[in-house]
């Protein structure tokens, strides 16, 4: 069973509110404590910035997408790149910044009236956590346009954070994805683990709110590495 992962006890001893989410600025989601996630500390100070390797868009921040840094570059080396603003060239929706989508190779506003019907989004992903079988496949996801016109409230299902209302992000909950609150100052957050520390991420949290970052709580510096408590703190 997945007792250690799915048990409500996994994150129930943390300070409220826990229905929400936590993490660090710019990242879409982070794992609940005790639940490993193949992430990394990608958001560092500018003078210490390092490209963050990724396998898929979901591993990058809400304002980023996952791709090879050079045109026609090695497909095996992908990093999180800054999203493309309106009127910039694109190949898929994830390349465009929140509030935009990719139409005819150009990022356009999703608020425009001509955004009707259904968008066909093709994403190729390689998957890992099967717990019995490992397989990779391509999937074509049909997104209904109504998701872009009516923003999801807390608890609503979503595909990405742009589907959720202001102050919410799209994060995994059990086996689905729902809109959860972005964390406020003092709320518990979770730093992504280093790449390679793979685990099943069942309860994701959002990132810390604007002007906040996920850092070790001062009185927890003495604690062992594994039990350090992180909270959203002012920069």
């Amino acid at each position: 069973t997945l007792n250690s992962v799915l048990n409500s006890n996994a994150i129930k001893n943390l300070p409220p509110p826990l229905g929400g989410a936590a993490g660090h600025p710019g990242s879409a989601v982070s794992a609940a404590p005790g639940i490993l996630y193949p992430g990394g500390n990608k958001y560092q100070t500018i003078d210490n910035y390092q490209p963050y390797p990724c396998a898929e868009d979901e591993e990058c921040g809400t304002d980023e997408y996952c791709a090879s840094p050079t045109r026609g570059g090695d497909a095996g080396v992908q990093i999180c790149l800054a999203c493309r603003k309106r009127r910039k060239r694109c190949m898929r929706h994830a390349m465009c910044c929140p509030g935009n989508y990719c139409k005819n190779g150009i990022c356009v506003s999703s608020d425009q009236n001509n955004f009707r019907g259904e968008i066909e989004e093709t994403i190729t992903e390689s998957f890992g956590n099967d717990h019995s079988t490992l397989d990779g496949y391509s999937r074509r996801t049909t997104l209904s346009s109504k998701m872009y016109h009516s923003k999801g409230q807390e608890g609503s299902v979503c595909l990405r954070s742009s589907d959720c209302a202001t102050g919410l992000c799209c994060a995994r909950h059990f086996w689905s994805k729902i809109c959860k609150p972005v964390l406020k100052e003092g709320q518990v957050c979770t730093k992504h683990r280093r790449k390679g520390s793979h685990g099943l991420e069942i309860f994701q949290r959002c990132y810390c709110g604007e002007g906040l970052s996920c850092r070790i709580q001062k009185d927890h510096h003495q604690a062992s590495n594994s039990s350090r408590l992180h909270t959203c703190q002012r920069h």
């Epitope: 826990l18 998957f127 595909l159 909950h173 059990f174 086996w175 689905s176």
Partner: antibody
């Protein structure tokens, strides 16, 4: 209209294979995890398997591990259960169910699988 | 796995009289999101299970208000204020806080 429709059941000999399908409609299928649940004749309900919204995570009941494979095609709004090396004890009505994260949703009518020589 | 234990396993009720079914889980079903992932289903003869109550006490759409759910943590109860002939069948409690989802053994309700 929000609904789930299972199909693909039938009579099959022990050791053979069968593939069940579950067609979903009326909701954003690709945002939800999906489950298979079964019920043997005259018995209670038993959970079989789950797949995450994007197909990246799967988990199985011990009784079917290594024999059954759950998968999904989000472009077709369809959930699958590939059942190999079937045994008599797999005889049951199989239901697909949506992950219970927001509004609850009823199950489908189920599809009957009979494993018999 | 979380074990769900229902009682009684069978219940014979006079129409118009109340009925109560208990369900106990081997560990808390209260999630850190504040929700308690406990459900009640009714399976009428020859039909698939139909959802009655979700998250302990919320009636699913179309379910008569004579059905009510209560409880918290590990102890839950389904009450039928006045049993009607159409309420016969097997009632199951189910938890979804953890996979595998697990079900109670079922309570068979019949009319006297």
């Amino acid at each position: 209209q929000v609904q789930l429709v299972e199909s693909g059941g039938g009579v099959v000999q022990p050791g053979r294979s069968l593939r069940l399908s579950c067609a979903a409609s009326g909701f954003t299928f690709s945002s939800y995890g999906m489950h298979w649940v079964r019920q043997a004749p005259g018995k209670g309900l038993g959970w079989v398997a789950v797949i995450s919204y994007d197909g990246s995570d799967k988990y199985y009941a011990d009784s079917v591990k290594g024999r059954f494979t759950i998968s999904r095609d989000n472009s077709k709004n369809t959930l699958y259960l590939q059942m190999n090396s079937l045994r008599a004890e797999d005889t049951a009505v199989y239901y697909c169910a949506r992950d219970l994260v927001d509004t609850a949703m009823p199950w489908g009518q189920g599809t009957t699988v009979t494993v018999s020589s | 796995d979380i074990v769900m234990t229902q009682s009684p396993l069978s219940l014979s009720v006079t129409p118009g009289q109340p009925a109560s079914i208990s369900c106990k889980s081997s560990q808390s079903l209260l999630h850190s999101d504040g929700k308690t992932y406990l459900y009640w289903y009714l399976q009428k003869p020859g039909q698939p299970p139909q959802l009655l109550i979700y998250e302990v006490s919320n009636r699913f759409s179309g379910v008569p208000d004579r059905f009510s759910g209560s409880g918290s943590g590990t102890d839950f109860t389904l009450k039928i204020s006045r049993v009607e002939a159409e309420d016969v069948g097997v009632y199951y409690c189910m938890q979804s806080i953890q996979v595998p989802w697990t079900f109670g053994q079922g309570t068979k309700v019949e009319i006297k």
